[in-house]
Structures are given as structure tokens and as C-alpha cells.
């Protein structure tokens, strides 16, 4: 018995097609993914494959525009629209708090959404009941197919699920389900997640009675023979780890974005067994036509959107100083109020002992692309902090040594002078550089504010501790030759898309007047 | 002819001892879990044991636990139910069922047990 | 006393339309898929609906499941003097760790 699985994961409100690297759509001809074009491809393949099903491995919150205006009715909407048949909750489903899940999404799809590691408690318990479930079996042809969800345990540091939901270790949590599907006699199953590919491995290895993973989080991508676009494989599609009881288990990812398909054909025998796995992602370019009553739809939605972006978020009563003669030369305003929203963005009250888990961020100042002049009534809108942030990227999560942050410094004014992007804004950290000494050897003094005290102050930053930090993904990935994040990164967990970041910050805010405030200093 | 067939029923005494056994032919038996399932006389039905496909793993209604024990002869296509320590409340139709996809999808004719003195 | 509760009698006449209702709680319908059987006179059950709302292969479109929080239903539609039988709704039970029966419903076609 042959199944096909197509599946999804990251998809991060690119509902419009986008460009290559998934930023806004600039030439058309070129352009790619997007919810119109992915239908055209899964309709092709439900008409000429028998069993089929489209999975969504999370994620689908967070990321554009759309979401900022729409906050998750549109996934649901279009979700509904491509006949998902099963979707597991990411973190970023947790944006906007269980509300911000369950009114727009859990109550409007018409899919099964799921999680086994998510346990609800308190008053949320009875209200969240049945709208999520920890399994679903579903009918494919005369068989039938049992789909074990599971989210990313570090929700509670990524997310707002607040405090009635608990979540599990992965692995401990998807064994009784499985084994009870295994009861039931179903017997093939996928378990369908959220987690990342190191976790997606282990629970093809530990989880006794899991046949398939298809994962999300970490944006891997895995192709088998020449890639077809920029993206460098992790391994080849499907991955196969030997589980502890000696099956193979393929493990499957489609990058991010909705850039890509994944298709996976899995051959079992007549006790659920796998014989066989084989696909490759499917890269949704220009040559796949985008399906035109979906596309009128989007048309539609997208209007609300272009109101959206000239009405204003909040007020500045200073100018928001984000020239690149300020912010790769020095500390300026528009980079601390960056660095304050990332911060704000990401403040979840860990426990007693530590006041938040997060203080820090970096950001590079060639990624402030334009000023906001307060003499316009000292109105912001979204239009204003597009261009100030054009690239469509996210604030991320990271850990790192202490060692390595002193080098990124260095990095940060190794060619001082010269109007390079990779000059570091901050905050939550005071650096004093010393430009007379010679490249590498440059700060003198690097202080970072603590987390685990109930007064925030700073302290000497300690090489061999690790800590975390919030920036740019494009730092993350190494972007503007900050090769060492990239390479000596301990953990890297994607976060919120930048202007959403800022916009919601400004809204809270209402008023703002970000000062230049020592932060970074030369002696 | 895919079917399931229970024999082993009959007439037995309060504390006796019963063995029922199912033969399935027409399908992969290997392949499936199964269950016993027992009426009594104009009444409805009650779930009383299964035994997983895979693994082999049994479960029991509280009434007949520590006294009913569920196996399975995969090579001779075989369910069994073997009944200690009978009571008068156990006599019923058992029928054996196989469970399909999270469901009983095929059952027996059904074998009568009497527990009387 | 069966911990999924039907309404022991339902009738109809030739052509209406009957509905069964099965009741439950959190630990069985609440978490997990309803089945439904058809047990006419003198014979064994036979499956009618599987995971809620899925007609076996053969048994007419007539018949329809349903599954909302803690209850499910059956629906027979253009009753025919035929489905006069006894109906079962059944559903694993988390709890007890084991398949749970409905009471059963007899039908009457008038």
C-alpha cells in the first residue's frame, strides 16, 4: 500500500508568493511558493496519486504582514481552502497567547490540529478541550493513517502559551500515544512536529512504532541529487535513522517559507511495515502557475492590508536617527529602539530566581535602512518601519559562549571607519572600544546586563559562560562576516519577523523617545 | 471467505473452567489486533478482553480481570480466551472480533457459554 | 449501567428520518473515535460507521455519523423496514483502558 505525503512547515504568512530568498515579491516571472501556486501543485498530485495526504508541520503564524493585520484568521482560511488535512502546532502558534491560538485558528479550521506534548491545566483545560488533539487517525483510501503531533518544549521561552500549558518532553509524551494507536491497530503512523531536526531524529529513533517523522522549527532542508535552487541540503530527503528496535525511519523536512513542497511516497506492507521511502522537496517556482480562484481570493484579502500599513502604530517625540552615518559609526537611537522592542518582544518570566531569560541583543547597524522624521506629527506608521527594516527577516533567539560574543565585538569595528553593515547596535550590553589598538583587540570593556538577579545591573562579561541573545537571523546565519555566531552558536531558535517586533512595541508603547545613552563608547 | 469462527462454548459449572478459541481464515491474521466481545442473554454488548497486533499487549475489563486470560497462535491463525473461576454472571454469546482501524470491523458468529449449577 | 448512554427505544416510519444519539464523557468519546454497529435479530454485530463519520464499504449513504465534544450520532435517513435492529455506538475508553459499548438502541420502523 502506497501513500503520498506532501507537506509544509515554517510556512510564516507567505501567503503571497515571494521572491527567492522569501522576502516581498519584486518580478513576478521570478517569483515563487505562495498559497495559490502550492494549491495548483497539491491539486495536480491529488488527481493523479490515490493516497494522499497535506500535512503542516507548524509554524504557519508569524512572519508577514498578513499576520500582523489578520493574526491567524487568514491561516485557518486558507489552511480550509487547500483541504489540509492535519497540522501540528509550532511555537510561533503561541504569537498572540492561547486566545490568539484558539479563536482565529483551533476554532476555524476545519483540519485536526495537533500536539501530544501540550497539556492543558487550570480553567484553560476545559476551554481549550477538544480543539487540539495529541493524535488523529484518518481515513486514506480503504486504510487508514494515525498522525501523533508534538511542539517544541522551548515553547515557553520562544512563545506566549502562558501558564496553563504545560509541555512535555517530545519522546515521553508521544510513547503512549503511539502505543495506544498500536492498540487500536493502527498501524502506520507519522508522528508530525515541531521541534527541530535533532529532535525529529531522535524520535524516529526512540519512539517505538513511529514509521514517518515529518518535522519543522529548524528550516532544514534535504534534497536527494542536485538542488534546485539556493538552498544547500543538511542531508539527503528523506534522512533514514535506524530506530533502537532496528526499523528505518525516514525523517522528513521542507525548509521554510512555503518555498518548497515536500513529497514523500512510502510503500508499507500489509502489517504497517515500511519497504520504501523516496521523494525530494518540490520547489514551487514560476513554472507551476499559480491557481487563479485562490489567487482572487488572496487579492481579496490583501486589500485590508494595504489600509493597514499607512495607519498609525503610535507617536515619536524625538527623530529616530537610523541614517547609516549614525548607526554603523556609533550608538544611535533608532538601534536602541530596535533593541528595546526585540528585548520587550521576548520578555517571559522564567521563574524566582531570574528576572527574564533574555537581556541581551545585537543588531547591525547596516540592517537600519532609513530614519523616521518626527515632524511628520510625530506619526508611525507600518510603511515607515518597512523602510526602515525592508528585509523581511526575524529576531532570533540564540545561545552563546561569552568568548564568542567578545569576538563578534571585535568583528563589529575590525574595519572601523569605512560604513560597514556589521557595526553592532545593542542593548542590554555597554561595550568601550579602543580604536587605537589594532583590529581584534579593540574592546576593552564589555559589560552585560544580568538575568538571573531581581535588579538588573551589569556585570563583566565572562568568556566561558553561555548566554542568550536576541538578534537578526541574518546574523544568526552569519550574515555581514559574523562567521563565529554562525559556527559557534549553541542554539538557534527563529523568533518574530522584525517589523511586527517593532510595530507592536511602538503600539505598546503609544509614545516613544529613544536616547542616545552610553551604551557604546570609545576611550 | 474472510471470517472468523469461535468454538469451545458450552454448559459449565460456577468456578469452572472454559477455553474458547477463534480460527480466522481469509486474511493475514499477524496482522491484526483482536477482541473478545460477550452478550448476555438479552442484553447488550460488553467489551471484555483485546490483545494487540504488534506487540502483544493485553487488556481486560475490570470484571473479568485476573480471571480471563487473552492469547494469540500466530501460526495457527488462532485467537484464544481462556475463562477461570466462572460465575453465573458470565454466561453469554462471546464473540470474537478483530479490530481493524481503531474499530471492531469483523466478528464471529459468536460461541454460547452457561454457567450454572 | 453502560457509561456511554443511547436511548434504549427509537421508531420512524418508512422513509423518515431517525437520529440515535450516544453520550459519553472527556476519557472516551471526548478523546477518541466513535463507531457504530447495526445488530439485527439473531445475528452478530455488523460495522456501520468507523472514526466518527466513516461509512464502511457497502453500507448505504443512508446512514451518517457524527461526533461533537463528548457525544456522537447516528443519523438513518429514508428509513427502510429493513433497519429495524439493534444499534450500538462503541468507543475506547482512556481510562479503563479498554472499548466501551453504548446500551443500545432498538429501532422500530412503524
Known amino acids: 500500500w502506497e501513500l503520498t505525503i506532501l507537506h509544509t512547515n515554517d510556512v510564516h504568512s507567505r501567503l503571497e508568493q515571494t521572491s527567492e530568498d522569501s522576502s516581498k515579491c519584486v518580478n513576478a516571472s521570478r517569483c515563487m511558493g505562495g498559497v495559490a501556486r502550492l494549491f495548483t501543485k497539491v491539486q495536480q498530485i491529488r488527481r493523479a496519486e490515490p493516497n494522499v495526504l497535506l500535512l503542516d508541520a507548524g509554524d504557519q503564524y508569524q512572519g508577514t504582514i498578513w499576520f500582523t493585520v489578520y493574526k491567524g484568521a487568514e491561516v485557518a482560511h486558507f489552511m480550509n481552502a487547500l483541504r489540509y488535512d492535519a497540522m501540528a502546532l509550532g511555537n510561533h502558534e503561541f504569537d498572540n497567547g492561547v486566545e490568539g491560538l484558539i479563536e482565529p485558528l483551533l476554532k476555524e479550521a476545519k483540519f485536526p490540529i495537533l500536539s501530544a506534548n501540550i497539556k492543558a491545566k487550570g480553567p484553560l483545560a476545559s476551554q481549550i478541550s477538544g480543539l487540539y488533539l495529541p493524535y488523529k487517525v484518518l481515513p486514506v483510501g480503504d486504510e487508514v493513517v494515525g498522525i501523533v503531533g508534538y511542539t517544541s518544549k522551548e515553547t515557553p521561552f520562544l512563545s506566549n502559551p502562558g501558564t496553563n500549558l504545560v509541555f512535555e518532553d517530545e519522546i515521553t509524551a508521544l510513547q503512549p500515544e503511539v502505543d495506544k494507536l498500536k492498540t487500536l491497530n493502527v498501524n502506520k503512523i507519522i508522528a508530525l512536529g515541531h521541534s527541530g531536526f535533532e529532535t525529529d531524529k531522535l524520535i524516529a529513533q526512540k519512539v517505538r512504532g513511529v514509521d514517518v517523522v515529518v518535522g519543522g522549527h529548524s528550516n532544514t532542508f534535504l534534497y536527494t541529487g542536485n538542488p534546485p535552487s539556493k538552498e544547500v541540503p543538511a542531508g539527503k530527503y528523506p534522512f533514514i535513522v535506524t530506530s533502537d528496535d532496528g526499523r528505518k525511519v525516514p525523517v522528513v523536512q521542507a525548509y521554510a517559507f512555503g518555498k518548497y513542497l515536500g513529497y514523500l511516497k512510502i510503500e508499507f506492507d500489509e502489517r504497517g511495515n515500511v519497504i520504501s521511502s523516496h521523494g525530494n522537496p518540490i520547489l514551487l517556482n514560476s513554472s507551476i502557475p499559480e491557481d487563479p480562484s485562490i489567487k482572487a481570493d488572496i487579492n481579496k484579502w490583501r486589500i485590508k492590508l494595504d489600509n493597514y500599513s499607512t495607519q498609525e502604530l503610535g507617536k515619536t517625540i524625538v527623530y529616530l536617527d537610523g541614517s547609516s552615518q549614525s548607526c554603523r559609526f556609533r550608538e544611535c537611537n533608532m538601534g536602541n529602539l530596535i533593541c528595546d522592542a526585540m528585548i520587550n518582544n521576548n520578555l517571559r518570566h522564567a521563574d524566582e530566581m531570574f528576572w527574564n531569560h533574555v537581556s541581551m541583543c545585537i543588531l547591525n547597524g547596516g540592517g537600519i535602512r532609513s530614519p523616521i522624521d518626527e515632524r511628520n506629527n510625530g506619526t508611525i506608521t507600518w510603511e515607515n518601519l518597512a523602510a526602515v527594516l525592508p528585509f523581511g527577516g526575524t529576531f532570533d533567539l540564540v545561545q552563546l559562549k561569552g568568548s564568542t560574543l567578545k569576538k563578534a565585538f571585535e568583528h563589529s569595528v575590525h574595519r572601523y571607519g569605512q560604513s560597514t553593515g556589521e557595526f553592532l547596535q545593542v542593548g542590554g550590553i555597554h561595550v568601550v572600544y579602543d580604536l587605537s589598538r589594532k583590529p581584534g583587540d579593540r574592546v576593552v570593556k564589555l559589560d552585560v546586563l544580568c538575568t538571573k538577579c531581581r535588579v538588573p545591573s551589569y556585570d563583566p562579561l565572562k568568556m566561558d559562560e553561555i548566554y542568550k541573545v536576541i538578534l537578526p537571523n541574518f546574523l544568526a546565519n552569519g550574515g555581514d562576516g559574523f562567521q563565529m555566531i554562525k559556527d559557534e552558536l549553541l542554539r538557534h531558535d527563529s523568533g518574530d519577523q522584525d517589523i511586527n517586533v517593532v510595530s507592536t512595541y511602538i503600539s505598546k508603547m503609544k509614545v516613544i523617545y529613544p536616547a542616545v545613552e552610553g551604551r557604546i563608547k570609545f576611550s | 471467505e474472510v471470517q472468523l469462527l469461535e468454538s469451545g462454548g458450552g454448559l459449565v459449572q460456577p468456578g469452572g473452567s472454559l477455553r474458547l478459541s477463534c480460527a480466522a481464515s481469509?486474511?493475514?491474521?499477524?496482522?491484526?489486533?483482536y477482541s473478545w466481545v460477550r452478550q448476555a442473554p438479552g442484553k447488550g454488548l460488553e467489551w471484555v478482553s483485546a490483545?494487540?497486533?504488534?506487540?502483544?499487549?493485553?487488556y481486560y475489563a475490570d470484571s473479568v480481570k485476573g480471571r480471563f486470560t487473552i492469547s494469540r497462535d500466530n501460526s495457527k491463525n488462532t485467537l484464544y480466551l481462556q475463562m477461570n473461576s466462572l460465575r453465573a454472571e458470565d454466561t453469554a454469546v462471546y464473540y470474537c472480533?478483530?479490530?481493524?482501524?481503531?474499530?471492531?470491523?469483523?466478528w464471529g458468529r459468536g460461541t454460547l457459554v452457561t454457567v450454572s449449577s | 449501567q453502560s457509561v456511554l448512554t443511547q436511548p434504549p427505544s427509537a421508531s420512524g416510519t418508512p422513509g423518515q428520518r431517525v437520529t440515535i444519539s450516544c453520550s459519553g464523557s472527556?476519557?472516551?468519546?471526548?478523546?477518541?473515535?466513535v463507531n457504530w454497529y447495526q445488530q439485527l435479530p439473531g445475528t452478530a454485530p455488523k460495522l456501520l460507521i468507523y472514526?466518527?463519520?466513516q461509512r464502511l464499504g457497502g453500507v448505504p449513504d443512508r446512514f451518517s455519523g457524527s461526533k461533537s465534544g463528548t457525544s456522537a450520532s447516528l443519523a438513518i435517513s429514508g428509513l427502510q423496514s429493513e433497519d429495524e435492529a439493534d444499534y450500538y455506538c462503541?468507543?475506547?475508553?482512556?481510562?479503563?483502558?479498554?472499548?466501551?459499548f453504548g446500551g443500545g438502541t432498538k429501532l422500530t420502523v412503524l
Open positions: 472480533a478483530r479490530l481493524g482501524y481503531s474499530t471492531i470491523d469483523l
Open positions: 481469509g486474511f493475514t491474521f499477524s496482522s491484526y489486533a
Open positions: 490483545i494487540s497486533g504488534s506487540w502483544g499487549r493485553t
Open positions: 472527556l476519557s472516551n468519546i471526548g478523546r477518541n473515535d
Open positions: 472514526l466518527n463519520n
Open positions: 462503541a468507543t475506547w475508553d482512556d481510562s479503563l483502558k479498554g472499548w466501551l
